[in-house]
């Protein structure tokens, strides 16, 4: 049982700590090729590559406040959202918004979270309550994950919503008695 996702006041979905997003299931070995779907051409396409490292995907940065109950982070956090389709790195700038023109058949590559980081967030609460903290688990980088369409299947499951959800956590409040901790916090230890 993991830290559950909850919808906070800012309507962001923030999973709690134990619910680390899992990468999508590996579908590479489930490859089926439909000749009709390929238009009678061989399955290979000049732009396809077997090396996932040659593919690239976009990392979109966005900033949001973290909320928990009636509390809100003193500062916004910046995190990544992994954006949609992957393309060969050399073609990606031209491929944005162009869909699947560069590979009409064969493997599909999706942009999903790769690494995460935890960030301490100081929460400001109403009514003079003790400052509180949580740790937010944020996407630190994205990667291309190779998937394969099933036979006659043109649409792939979108893993974005489950894979890209940041992980929530809280950070300690600064304490007058702990100058070292305060300094680390002010310098954003993460």
């Amino acid at each position: 049982q993991g830290w559950q996702a909850f919808k906070n006041d800012a309507t962001e979905i923030i999973p709690e700590l134990g619910e680390y997003p899992e990468p999508p299931p590996e579908l590479e070995n489930n490859k089926t090729m439909n000749r009709a779907e390929n238009g009678g051409r061989p399955p290979h396409h000049p732009f396809e590559t077997k090396d996932v490292s040659e593919y690239s995907c976009r990392e979109l940065h966005f900033t949001r406040y973290v909320t928990d109950g009636p509390c809100r982070s003193a500062k916004p956090v910046t995190e990544l959202v992994c954006s949609g389709q992957c393309g060969p790195a050399r073609l990606l700038p031209n491929a944005i918004g162009r869909g699947k023109w560069w590979r009409p058949s064969g493997p599909d590559f999706r942009c999903i979270p790769d690494r995460y980081r935890a960030q301490r967030v100081q929460l400001l609460c109403p009514g003079g309550e003790a400052p509180r903290a949580r740790k937010v688990r944020l996407v630190a980088s994205c990667k291309c994950k190779r998937l394969t369409r099933f036979h006659n299947q043109s649409e792939l499951k979108d893993f974005g919503t489950e894979a890209a959800r940041p992980q929530k956590g809280r950070k300690p409040r600064p304490r007058a008695r702990s100058a070292k901790a305060n300094q680390a916090e002010l310098e954003n230890a993460y």
Epitope: W3, E16, G18, E129, K135, G169, K171, S178
Partner: antibody, heavy 118, light 107 residues
Framework: QVQLVQSGAEVKKPGASVKVSCKVS????????QHWVRQAPGKGLEWMGW????????EYASKFQGRVTMTEDTSTDTAYMELSSLRSEDTAVYYC???????????WGQGTTVTVSS | DIQMTQSPSSLSASVGDRVTITCKAS??????VAWYQQKPGKAPKLLIY???TRWTGVPSRFSGSGSGTDFTLTISSLQPEDFATYYC?????????FGGGTKVEIK
């Protein structure tokens, strides 16, 4: 699967110290806050404090200030709570708990019984 | 320190009953209250936080309400596995403190 496994029962003499360990698995300990809560026999729960393994920040209940030390080894994902100058009223089950906040206790260890007796 | 006073200290109920446990804070704690369930010989389990938010996997028959100084944990239809001791906890001000517990027993 989040799991916290604590060290075994301890019997101590008054004035001695005890160090209880709590091995965390299922996520990195540095991404959490570690809490310690105790429960005297037949009594309620008493919060002792929390620590942040990432930077070593701590918050102790004033009642335990000066007697308790909470530390972690992030390389082994293990938290420790040391209580010194033990007295008979420190006889209790000591629980470690973890969570992503400084204020609620999401997952708990199974508890470690510490008996202080001369 | 903020005192959390639970009532009743114990109650007897039958499976299917609606059970209400109250917790009164000695000062305003806004909604900074959590509820835990503890069975004999076991560690507590988080049920509710922020007075009314259910924790992961907690059945919908458990609900929390209240703000300020008065809080309630309600079990809408008591199940056999719900016989346990329930604790409230405030996290409005240090030190975090718990209520004395309410033991729910089989009638």
């Amino acid at each position: 699967q989040v799991q916290l496994v604590q060290s075994g029962a301890e019997v101590k003499k008054p004035g001695a110290s005890v160090k209880v360990s709590c091995k965390v698995s299922g996520f990195p300990i540095k991404d959490t806050f570690q809490h310690w809560v105790r429960q005297a026999p037949g009594k309620g729960l008493e919060w002792m404090g929390w620590s942040d393994p990432e930077i070593g920040d701590t918050e102790y209940a004033s009642k335990f200030q000066g007697r308790v030390t909470m530390t972690e080894d992030t390389s082994t994902d293990t938290a420790y709570m040391e209580l010194s100058s033990l007295r008979s009223e420190d006889t209790a089950v000591y629980y470690c708990a973890t969570g992503d906040t400084t204020y609620k206790f999401d997952f708990w260890g199974q508890g470690t019984t510490v008996t202080v007796s001369s | 320190d903020i005192q959390m006073t639970q009532s009743p200290s114990s109650l007897s109920a039958s499976v299917g009953d609606r059970v209400t446990i109250t917790c009164k804070a000695s000062q305003d704690v806004h909604t900074a209250v959590a509820w835990y369930q503890q069975k004999p010989g076991k560690a507590p389990k988080l049920l509710i936080y922020w007075a009314s938010t259910r924790w992961t996997g907690v059945p919908s028959r458990f609900s929390g309400s209240g703000s300020g100084t008065d809080f309630t944990l309600t079990i809408s239809s008591l199940q056999p596995e719900d016989f346990a001791t329930y604790y409230c906890q405030q996290y409005s001000d240090y030190p975090w403190t718990f209520g004395g517990g309410t033991k729910v027993e089989i009638k």
